[in-house]
């Protein structure tokens, strides 16, 4: 029986009965917040073999092992993950071992096992046999291994039953519990699964099978399941569904998303039955189950019940996320905010059409209107008193409307009004008149030439770069010395630079008047020698990275014909040199015969250039003969058992920290202080833990359904 969609068992352990007939959970399985310690021995779900999304266990009192609950759980597919994880075991106070002895494959995602004060048998499981990459696993704050004394079956009797693998240079037995080995298939099977008797399964099987080389005997499917058979792709007239099975059109036509209060229904696209058309596609008509490509951004009409939508915060802008056509009027009144320009672009950047008017007033946080980066039409179907459809009043820091070289905006009906925008040059307004087709509509008082641009350097000269030199992490640039009419008016220069993968940045990107700016700024004093050209060395840059750079002259606010003269350069794009790449990630090696090793790795996170080849080096190592860390027959060798508190493992500091013995005659010396890099790494680690814990709490503590 397929159960789902997603099963959440909380508060009452008897809810576990819901799993009684499940063979596959299509979705996630949550078992959490059961605070009363119960006896779980009577609960056993041997039918459950597959969870298609993830398994989350959190604060379940009294549960000591998962092996009895889910003895045959073989595959967690990770089709959808919980914060990048397919298996999360968090704050399970009484869990002593994981015990999922039949778990053979986690298809996607990593594992997070954290703050389980009594949990052992973690170092005895080789997760690389279950997951593709173990580098993202997070196993922290559980019972310290030296307090666990984990013993695999048969070790005490000196008849070890489990197989050995190497983890972190330790060659050891692999097991889930004191009486359950970790299953490994013969090397002859390669990537294939195997039966209990070590016979290789059909290539389409995943995890295990009941008979060898038979695609109808799989416990789970590598690709898709259809009519009792594991298939590499869904047959004609069937469609992939939830990442693991094939369904027919009729099935897909009759299902609705439980996450929505509308009844939009699923669609078929690219051979898959899915909840929504993917990005860039739209349903082909109201009764259609199929998607067609959108021309440009997909249309989404948003309507304001009160006709006028006031944008006075990020929260109010959030309501417009994804909207391309706004039916109504926009009133923008942003007085303050953090990182406001990029937040507004995120939520309003897709708007193409406003059917009514646009009014921007008292928006002192705005430097530019470029956050409305796709606005192309203001219809002016509704206008302000005086027949205005674009109205800009008292915006103390507004300097740019849009980048008119890359913008077509039409105002179909209505006039424009501009007043009390002291940093907005009148030339910018006149340019908007031309582009929008409103020239001639405005009367004299509609664009005030006295109080617009009164505090801006509106007459700008162009600074020209004279030389650029690059290295792997530095750029040196120089530019012509700017000579204003009165040399004393030139104070200094400011260099602005930022990473720019594409040559499409503008001066006002990500900039607002509250201090947020996506550009880095460096002040450059005037060279004392009048014949030396000003310049700067930008350092601490990333190798093989394109940067955008421009320079502005800082001048006295000298008024000349009611305007301040200034100077700035065009934006220059320049790439740093290539450098040595960072180390390759997730290096894994496995032997597939007595004379071969297969080595796999992922590319480096920082290629620092175009990678052309890898160098693989190897050398023979002497076999590790020191197989036993402890002699368990000798009482004095067994570590003292102490109950772990479920906090993060930190070596205890004794009264006298002088533990390391230095070479020669020096005697004991203090442990080295942590480097800045180590401190930073610890800080980031602590931050990451907090972020995950917040995510966990926000996800699982939800209001009771009505």
């Amino acid at each position: 029986e397929i159960c789902g969609p997603g099963i959440d068992i909380r508060n009452d352990y008897q809810q576990l009965k819901r799993l009684e007939n499940c063979t596959v959970i299509e979705g996630y399985l949550h078992i959490l917040l059961i605070s009363k310690a119960e006896d779980y021995r009577s609960y056993r779900f041997p039918k459950l073999t597959v969870i298609t999304e993830y398994l989350l266990l959190f604060r379940v009192a009294g549960l000591e092992s998962l092996g009895d609950l889910f003895p045959n759980l073989t595959v967690i597919r990770g089709w959808k993950l919980f914060y990048n994880y397919a298996l999360v075991i968090f704050e399970m106070t009484n869990l002593k071992d994981i015990g999922l002895y039949n778990l053979r494959n986690i298809t996607r995602g990593a594992i997070r096992i954290e703050k389980n004060a009594d949990l052992c048998y973690l170092s005895t499981v080789d997760w690389s046999l279950i997951l593709d990459a173990v580098s993202n696993n997070y196993i922290v704050g559980n019972k310290p291994p030296k307090e666990c004394g984990d013993l695999c079956p048969g070790t005490m009797e000196e008849k070890p039953m489990c197989e050995k693998t190497t983890i972190n240079n330790e060659y050891n037995y692999r097991c889930w519990t004191t009486n359950r080995c970790q299953k490994m298939c013969p090397s002859t099977c390669g990537k294939r699964a195997c039966t209990e008797n070590n016979e290789c399964c059909h290539p389409e099987c995943l995890g295990s099978c009941s008979a060898p080389d038979n695609d109808t005997a799989c416990v789970a499917c590598r690709h898709y399941y259809y009519a009792g058979v594991c298939v590499p792709a869904c047959p004609p007239n069937t469609y992939r569904f939830e990442g693991w099975r094939c369904v027919d059109r009729d099935f897909c036509a009759n299902i609705l998303s439980a996450e929505s209060s509308d009844s939009e229904g699923f669609v078929i696209h690219d051979g898959e039955c899915m909840q929504e058309c993917p990005s860039g596609f739209i349903r082909n008509g109201s009764q259609s189950m199929y998607c067609i490509p959108c021309e440009g951004p997909c249309p989404k009409v948003c309507e304001e019940e009160k006709k006028t939508k006031t944008i006075d915060s990020v929260t109010s802008a959030q309501m417009l996320q994804g909207c391309t056509i706004f039916k109504g009027n926009l009133l923008i009144n942003i007085r303050r905010g953090n990182n406001i320009a990029s937040e507004l672009e995120n939520f309003m950047g897709l708007i193409e059409v406003v059917t009514g008017y646009v009014k921007i007033r008292h928006s002192h946080a705005l430097v530019s209107l470029s956050f409305l980066k796709n606005l192309r039409l203001i219809l002016g179907e509704e206008q302000l008193e005086g027949n205005y459809s674009f109205y800009v009043l008292d915006n103390q820091n507004l300097q740019q409307l849009w980048d008119w070289d890359h913008r077509n905006l039409t105002i179909k009906a209505g006039k424009m009004y501009f007043a009390f925008n002291p940093k907005l040059c009148v030339s910018e307004i006149y340019r908007m008149e031309e582009v929008t087709g409103t020239k001639g509509r405005q009367s004299k008082g509609d664009i005030n030439t006295r109080n617009n641009g009164e505090r801006a350097s509106c007459e700008s000269d162009v600074l020209h770069f004279t030389s650029t030199t690059t290295s792997k992490n530095r750029i040196i640039i120089t530019w012509h010395r700017y000579r204003p009419p009165d040399y004393r008016d030139l104070i200094s220069f400011t260099v602005y630079y930022k990473e720019a993968p594409f040559k499409n940045v503008t001066e006002y990107d990500g900039q607002d008047a509250c201090g947020s700016n996506s550009w880095n700024m460096v002040d450059v004093d005037l060279p004392p020698n009048k014949d030396v050209e000003p310049g700067i060395l930008l350092h601490g840059l990333k190798p093989w990275t394109q940067y955008a750079v421009y320079v502005k002259a800082v001048t006295l606010t000298m008024v000349e014909n009611d305007h301040i003269r200034g100077a700035k350069s065009e934006i220059l794009y320049i790439r740093t040199n290539a450098s040595v790449p960072s180390i390759p990630l997730d290096v894994l090696s496995a032997s597939n015969s007595s004379s071969q090793l297969i080595v796999k790795w992922n590319p480096p996170s920082l290629p620092n250039g175009n990678l052309s080849y890898y160098i693989v080096r190897w050398q023979r190592q002497p076999q590790d003969g020191y197989l036993y860390r402890h002699n368990y027959c000798s009482k004095d060798k067994i570590p003292i058992r102490k109950y772990a508190d479920g906090t993060i493992d930190i070596e205890e500091v004794t009264e006298n920290p002088k533990t390391e013995v230095c070479g020669g005659e020096k005697g004991p010396c203090c442990a080295c202080p942590k480097t800045e890099a180590e401190k930073q790494a610890e800080k980031e680690e602590a931050e990451y833990r907090k972020v995950f814990e917040n995510f966990l709490h926000n996800s699982i503590f939800v209001p009771r359904p009505e």
């Epitope: 009759n254 609705l256 009844s263 229904g265």
Partner: nanobody, 128 residues
Framework: EVQLVESGGGLVQPGGSLRLSCAAS????????MAWFRQAPGKEREGVSA????????YYADSVKGRFTISRDNSKNTLYLQMNSLRAEDTAVYYC?????????????????????WGQGTLVTVSS
């Protein structure tokens, strides 16, 4: 408070027609999916038809396809079910229901668990 009031039921001869209405209040009608269910004496409640809010996509049970038509008027906050070629087996109490968010994943349009609010029902009797 959400309210759904069905009307338009009554006695009709086989082959006849009826139009059911469901007047809704207490929620933003134009953003919620709606459906008609029915329950015949001694039988389980079953889905008859459903309609989405945004696009008007419709769903019908096999037994009523081609005979019944669901529609909605968002400006009047009303859901309709036009029933033609009625048969004796269509006799039942007809309920109007409104969709609700119901956790994760999916469900079939005719599953009652996907609907959060229900009307009191209107009786339709098809008899000669």
């Amino acid at each position: 408070e959400v309210q759904l009031v069905e009307s338009g039921g009554g006695l009709v001869q086989p082959g006849g027609s009826l139009r059911l209405s469901c007047a809704a209040s207490g929620f933003t009608f134009g953003t919620f999916g709606m459906a008609w269910f029915r329950q015949a004496p001694g039988k389980e409640r079953e889905g008859v038809s459903a309609i989405s809010a945004s696009s008007g996509r419709t769903y019908y049970a096999d037994s009523v396809k081609g005979r019944f038509t669901i529609s909605r008027d968002n400006s009047k906050n009303t859901l309709y079910l036009q029933m033609n070629s009625l048969r004796a087996e269509d006799t039942a109490v007809y309920y109007c229901a409104v969709r609700s968010k119901n956790g994760a994943g999916y469900g079939f349009w005719y599953e009652a668990r996907l609907y959060g609010y229900w009307g009191q029902g209107t009786l339709v009797t098809v008899s000669s």
